[in-house]
């Protein structure tokens, strides 16, 4: 019968040829009376057999990632009679893996959005690298993820590639971060290959800033001839938030005379001071009112940032008009 062990050949051998093993008949007494032959895909081009000894050689550099298995057939013939000594036999040559492929991030570019002020541990995104090497061959395709850039705000789970927040971030200080993740095979051991990817993490706004008046005192004037409904001037607050989180409502906090009103221009986010009742210079030539400003939308969990509304004082001077 045929005698052989399982055949393995390492991929990417840089030698001209590589001895894989021996195929022989147990009837072969070593006197060169038998001839061994190799048949099948790869015979003669990738593998050869020493026809006298049955020794098999790879005569070409192999790439396991291209082809990991060769199925060949062997024959052994008695040179004197030309007859087969053994029935033709099929055998397998397996290409064994070396760590010749670096991890690759296939879903690049990565981009994620996370609310500012998110607590530690908040999941941002998962990055995944793949390695063409054999996952069943040692640690050639076992990956470990690490953070090359992004501390102290982000962390990555070494085995999953899950990126989490590790420190609260304020969009009003910095609104986006570039995080660089490295994937290393061989679970980081010597001889490891690595690949990197960049993740753009954008912070979305939350309403963590209340509007604040630009001025603590505004001076306006109104003619005593002005009809009710007249706009006598504008006041303005600023809000570091953006979008609907910066939408605000102005209102009167103090006006004993009940002469003025404030309406909000939602286009410009300005407060417009309106004359509610006609004024008379001879009766009262100046007024003092207090205005306040609040955000339009404040979720319950963010009320802590909005406890005291910003206020401003408005001094209004009445202008005299000659009366007949």
């Amino acid at each position: 019968g045929w005698v052989w062990n399982q055949f393995f050949v390492p991929e990417e051998m840089n030698t001209t040829s590589h001895h894989i093993g021996q195929l022989r008949s147990d009837l072969d007494n070593g006197n060169n009376s038998f001839q061994y032959k190799l048949l099948g895909a790869g015979a003669g081009s990738t593998f050869i057999i020493d026809e006298r000894t049955g020794d098999i050689y790879a005569i070409q550099k192999l790439d396991r990632e291209e082809r990991s298995l060769y199925i060949l057939r062997a024959q052994v013939i008695d040179i004197a009679t030309g007859r087969a000594v053994e029935p033709e036999s099929e055998f397998v040559i397996k290409v064994s893996d070396i760590n010749d492929n670096e991890p690759k991030f296939l879903d690049e570019p990565y981009e994620a959005i996370v609310p500012e002020m998110s607590p530690e541990g908040t999941l941002v995104i998962q990055v995944t690298a793949s390695d063409a090497d054999d996952p069943s061959s040692g640690n050639n395709a076992r990956l470990l993820y690490s953070l090359l850039q992004g501390q102290p705000y982000f962390s990555v789970e070494p085995t999953t590639g899950v990126i989490r927040i590790s420190s609260k971030m304020d969009r009003e200080l910095q609104d986006e971060y570039w995080v660089i993740i490295q994937a290393k095979d061989m679970i980081g051991q010597p001889g490891a290959l690595s690949g990197t990817t960049s993740v753009l993490i954008k912070l979305s706004d939350v309403n963590d800033n209340k509007p604040i008046f630009k001025e603590s005192l505004y001076r306006l004037t109104v003619s005593e001839s002005a009809p009710t409904g007249t706009s006598i001037g504008t006041i303005m607050a600023y809000d570091n938030d953006i979008g609907e989180n910066a939408e605000m409502d102005y209102s009167i906090e103090e006006d004993d005379s009940q002469t003025f009103d404030i309406i909000t221009n939602h286009e410009t986010q300005e407060g417009i001071v309106i004359l509610k009742k006609k004024v008379d210079f001879e009766h009262q030539n100046h007024y003092g009112i207090r205005a306040k400003v609040k955000n339009h939308h404040v979720p319950e969990q963010l009320m802590k940032y909005h406890t005291e509304a910003s206020t401003t004082f408005i001094k209004i001077q009445v202008e005299d008009v000659d009366e007949p």
């Epitope: 030698t15 001209t16 040829s17 001895h19 003669g44 050869i48 020493d50 050689y57 005569i59 070409q60």
Partner: antibody, heavy 121, light 107 residues
Framework: EVQLLESGGGLVQPGGSLRLSCAAS????????MNWVRQAPGKGLEWVST????????YYADSVKGRFTISSDNSKSTLYLQMNSLRAEDTAVYHC??????????????WGQGTTVTVSS | EIVMTQSPVTLSLSLGERATLSCRAS??????LAWFQQKPGQAPRLLIY???TRATGIPARFSGSGSGTEFTLTISSLEPEDFAVYYC?????????FGGGTKVEIK
């Protein structure tokens, strides 16, 4: 008896081309690797190129890569070397040599007498 | 590439003497080394392959030894037809490379 007979050498100007042939007999040509080795006048041996049996794999010395092409015709049991963009330093006797068996597959166990290539203006 | 260095360049010996030729590889080539003999105007002839296996028809006075980076060709007793140039060659890595040769001449 294994025999190798080279032909096709001659005098050629720099930049010119030549095609060398090596007719083989006495063995199963397609089962063996074949080589070209050259020897400049008064110098040592220099490997040029190798082709595996059946022609699947070819290898070249850096000095000839991109200029020379090795090929074989199993039906004629003939090895070829197409030489283009020839230079003065390619002047040599060109030998073909048969590969061996097993672990000596990419070796050189039988040599031809050689054919002379002279590159000169 | 693997650099093969032969020494000495010339070896002057008398008939019947023992010749020892050395060949060193710049890195390990296992046992994938061959020795060739070349006489003026002739093609090289294979003497030894696999560092120590004599080719068909080669007399027993020729022997090879060594592995890795250091190799030796020994001619136990020089005959008149042995005076020639001897080359070592590695076939473990591409490109295949030859040593510069050792000329064995009559003293």
């Amino acid at each position: 008896e294994v025999q190798l007979l080279e032909s096709g050498g001659g005098l050629v100007q720099p930049g010119g081309s030549l095609r060398l042939s090596c007719a083989a007999s006495g063995f199963t040509f397609s089962s063996y690797a074949m080589n070209w080795v050259r020897q400049a006048p008064g110098k040592g041996l220099e490997w040029v190129s190798t082709i595996s049996g059946g022609g699947a794999n070819t290898y070249y010395a850096d000095s000839v890569k991109g200029r020379f092409t090795i090929s074989s015709d199993n039906s004629k049991s003939t090895l070829y070397l197409q030489m283009n963009s020839l230079r003065a330093e390619d002047t040599a006797v060109y030998h073909c040599a048969k590969g061996g068996m097993g672990g000596y597959y990419y070796g050189m166990d039988v040599w031809g007498q050689g054919t002379t290539v002279t590159v000169s203006s | 590439e693997i650099v093969m260095t032969q020494s000495p360049v010339t070896l002057s010996l008398s008939l019947g003497e023992r010749a020892t030729l050395s060949c060193r590889a710049s890195q390990s080539i296992s046992s994938n080394l061959a020795w060739f003999q070349q006489k003026p105007g002739q093609a090289p002839r294979l003497l030894i392959y696999g560092a120590f296996t004599r080719a068909t028809g080669i007399p027993a006075r020729f022997s090879g030894s060594g592995s890795g980076t250091e190799f030796t060709l020994t001619i136990s007793s020089l005959e008149p037809e042995d005076f020639a140039v001897y080359y070592c060659q590695q076939y473990n890595y591409w490109p295949l490379t030859f040593g510069g040769g050792t000329k064995v001449e009559i003293k």
